[in-house]
Interface confidence: low
Amino acid sequence: ASFFGENHLEVPVATALTDIDLQLQFSTSQPEALLLLAAGPADHLLLQLYSGRLQVRLVLGQEELRLQTPAETLLSDSIPHTVVLTVVEGWATLSVDGFLNASSAVPGAPLEVPYGLFVGGTGTLGLPYLRGTSRPLRGCLHAATLNGRSLLRPLTPDVHEGCAEEFSASDDVALGFSGPHSLAAFPAWGTQDEGTLEFTLTTQSRQAPLAFQAGGRRGDFIYVDIFEGHLRAVVEKGQGTVLLHNSVPVADGQPHEVSVHINAHRLEISVDQYPTHTSNRGVLSYLEPRGSLLLGGLDAEASRHLQEHRLGLTPEATNASLLGCMEDLSVNGQRRGLREALLTRNMAAGCRLEEEEYEDDAYGHYEAFSTLAPEAWPAMELPEPCVPEPGLPPVFANFTQLLTISPLVVAEGGTAWLEWRHVQPTLDLMEAELRKSQVLFSVTRGARHGELELDIPGAQARKMFTLLDVVNRKARFIHDGSEDTSDQLVLEVSVTARVPMPSCLRRGQTYLLPIQVNPVNDPPHIIFPHGSLMVILEHTQKPLGPEVFQAYDPDSACEGLTFQVLGTSSGLPVERRDQPGEPATEFSCRELEAGSLVYVHRGGPAQDLTFRVSDGLQASPPATLKVVAIRPAIQIHRSTGLRLAQGSAMPILPANLSVETNAVGQDVSVLFRVTGALQFGELQKQGAGGVEGAEWWATQAFHQRDVEQGRVRYLSTDPQHHAYDTVENLALEVQVGQEILSNL
């Protein structure tokens, strides 16, 4: 049965329990999970995971018994674990996966639990002894019986049959919101220094919640939703509301890259690299997070929050949920997937969007409007030619438009004044009895990648200015530094004078002011996606790839970037896989992405790496990766032995023999060596890469990878007849780096 982090089953108990024989098989990736509660007013039995350890609390009469599994054995590893708890004749015994973990004497009194059994969670039970218990189970109960009676029948609609795929979904599997009340809750989104939320969104929902994080002060929150087919973000703080809209349409059933970035000064939403942001003079300050980060839907409390808010979010809108999916979710740079969710409702694993490179055609519908803002404007000749009415002064003879427009040229990330030459009148204003202050400009559509800043009181909000302001250098365009080389402003130009003139000038003419952006080469930067500390086991090697460090360069492709390792080349620990022993002082971004590089530890304190990356014109500031070498710790995970018929062969598989190490994100070489002579058979390894039909050879050593690939076996060669089973004691030692574990 699948429990999604907020569900439970209730099983009535008719009488007091004298003997207890409880058997559970569960799997979860969460370190906290309430598995079972037998509840009475005071008496109770509680089984829960806490910090990945199984805890049993049994309260009988006035006595309390606590049993728990060892700290080194975490049960929150998504693997099914079998728990057996027996309480018989004054003795309690707990075993997990067939191993005795704890036992203790208990009072002989029966367990009085008239409130019944609660499986997977405690529901609305509000007993004092439940304070501080674990969250409801998010995971699977494969089996649950008490004294031979199943606790998983009947299921409720919210607890599903079988074990849901989402619990084993890796973080590259999309979150599928299948509606109508879908929701995924994750640990709180902290935005103390800055907060980022990134995902690829695919939906047709025109109104739907995307993300909600409540704040510590009553009424504070961050809310991102789809509003009328576009992204909107609302930040409510004690001192006011910040509201931000993005103009890229997202409700088209196609994938869109979404990024929300917030810090104390500004809020930015970006869709497919088209950003919208508040000014740096925003009212934002740190929002202390409270509760979970809700994605794709809202719970009752969040809905209430939003309904009470002056934005007037309607109950229908807040009760709805996203119908669609989020891929590549990351919160503050940390990848998140369904496995990390604290609870989910109506979710599916995946949305059938393959993890492949974006293709050109994904953005094809923008290419036709390379100079336009994301929403396509109706095709029109701008400005529409004006036909002057008869009887106007001769200055308006042959008049069609008031201004001749010239492109505004600005450096990437720079500023440029809007000047007379950009918006030059086609007629003599004095002759037409018009003053410059009567030619009124209003910005009807802003540029995608910058802002027209007006140094005129009140004008910034109204987005209006006059030709006199242009002459007096009161209007300047500030570019946001993005890479597009063209942009534009849409200006409505009207004349406010009360002199005879064409009526189209009174009504206004629309002009497109092209903006030409002169690119600036941005220097590349080195980023460490998982932090600038790398841990390696002593005397081993570890791949260096984009998961360790990357180059970020907004205007250069990976092909154009080269990394340099700074410092003396002698003893440099970076090498190419195919050139062992040869230091790699320089390598390309492509080599890094292809996984061609390794860090080799040869003893002593690990050498930190200082890199620089260059795009051929500019180099990044140096960045240092701190490297710590730790002594390998080897732990036997499984050593079960084999049983086989005399004269036959049996593979040794990870289920029979495997070890674990303390390697962090490192696939280390684990070598097993036979240290004693074999009496009744021989250990064999398959040659030629384990190809079907390849020969088996006697061996004294093999790697864990050989075991994982089924290429190691024991062959019984003893021809003698025995009246009893013979036992071959296989003495092995394990080596990782230079660390050896003997007498395995």
Partner: antibody
Framework: QVQLQQSGPELVKPGASVKISCKAS????????MNWVKQRPGQGLEWIGR????????NYNGKFKGKATLTADKSSSTAYMQVSSLTSVDSAVYFC??????????????WGQGTSVTVSS | NIVLTQSPASLAVSLGQRATISCRAS??????????MHWYQQKPGQPPKLLIY???NLESGVPARFSGSGSRTDFTLTIDPVEADDAATYYC?????????FGSGTKLEIK
């Protein structure tokens, strides 16, 4: 905007095969399922199957397994359906239709204009 | 396979009146709180056009005269008021499980 342009009408002999194409534009072709639907003259609609161009994954209606083969060419954003061992019951209009990329609904929101196949000796 | 039975097979409705078409599934098409039933309109010589998805959601660009309702096995498409341009054949379609299946169609004539 999204468009699906199908190849022209086909007149084929019994026992032969026919390959119909459907060229997609205006969206990320490899990220959406492409469905194929059959409609015999004056009759209703029958779903043949779907292909996911991103990885070539296919799902067929059991009735058309062995009869229809779906393929896709990402580089040209074109989906193909080959119908083999043709008989008179294969005479029909065949439509390609984009399946939404959203988890649900796998509705068919854009359709090709249809390709008429006539099987006659 | 889920069989969809549409009724009536044909229907004649006066201009401005209400048209109601029914679709019954041989088993429930509900999952995850959704009804995986959709409605299409097809005019002679044209491909089908999506009208309603997930039982009751209007596809963008479709007039609000069209509405859908129902759950589990019984679904209804309503056109109110009917206009001359609505003369066509209407199909229901389920995708709760493969193979996707369509109803046999209802031909709407305008009197």
């Amino acid at each position: 905007q999204v468009q699906l342009q199908q190849s022209g009408p086909e007149l084929v002999k019994p026992g032969a095969s026919v390959k119909i194409s459907c060229k997609a534009s205006g969206y990320a072709f490899s990220r959406s399922w492409m469905n194929w639907v059959k409609q015999r003259p004056g009759q209703g609609l029958e779903w043949i199957g779907r292909i996911y161009p991103g990885d070539g994954d296919t799902n067929y209606n059991g009735k058309f397994k062995g009869k229809a083969t779906l393929t896709a060419d990402k580089s040209s954003s074109t989906a193909y359906m080959q119908v083999s061992s043709l008989t008179s019951v294969d005479s029909a209009v065949y439509f390609c239709a984009r399946g939404n990329t959203v988890v649900v609904p796998y509705t068919m929101d854009y359709w090709g204009q249809g390709t008429s196949v006539t099987v006659s000796s | 396979n889920i069989v969809l039975t549409q009724s009536p097979a044909s229907l004649a409705v006066s201009l401005g009146q209400r048209a109601t078409i029914s679709c019954r599934a041989s088993e429930s098409v509900d999952s995850y709180g959704n009804s995986f039933m959709h409605w299409y309109q097809q005019k002679p010589g044209q491909p089908p056009k999506l009208l309603i998805y997930l039982a009751s959601n209007l596809e963008s660009g479709v007039p609000a005269r069209f509405s859908g309702s129902g759950s589990r096995t019984d679904f209804t498409l309503t056109i109110d008021p009917v206009e001359a341009d609505d003369a066509a054949t209407y199909y229901c379609q389920q995708n709760n499980e493969d193979p996707l299946t369509f109803g046999s169609g209802t031909k709407l004539e305008i009197k």
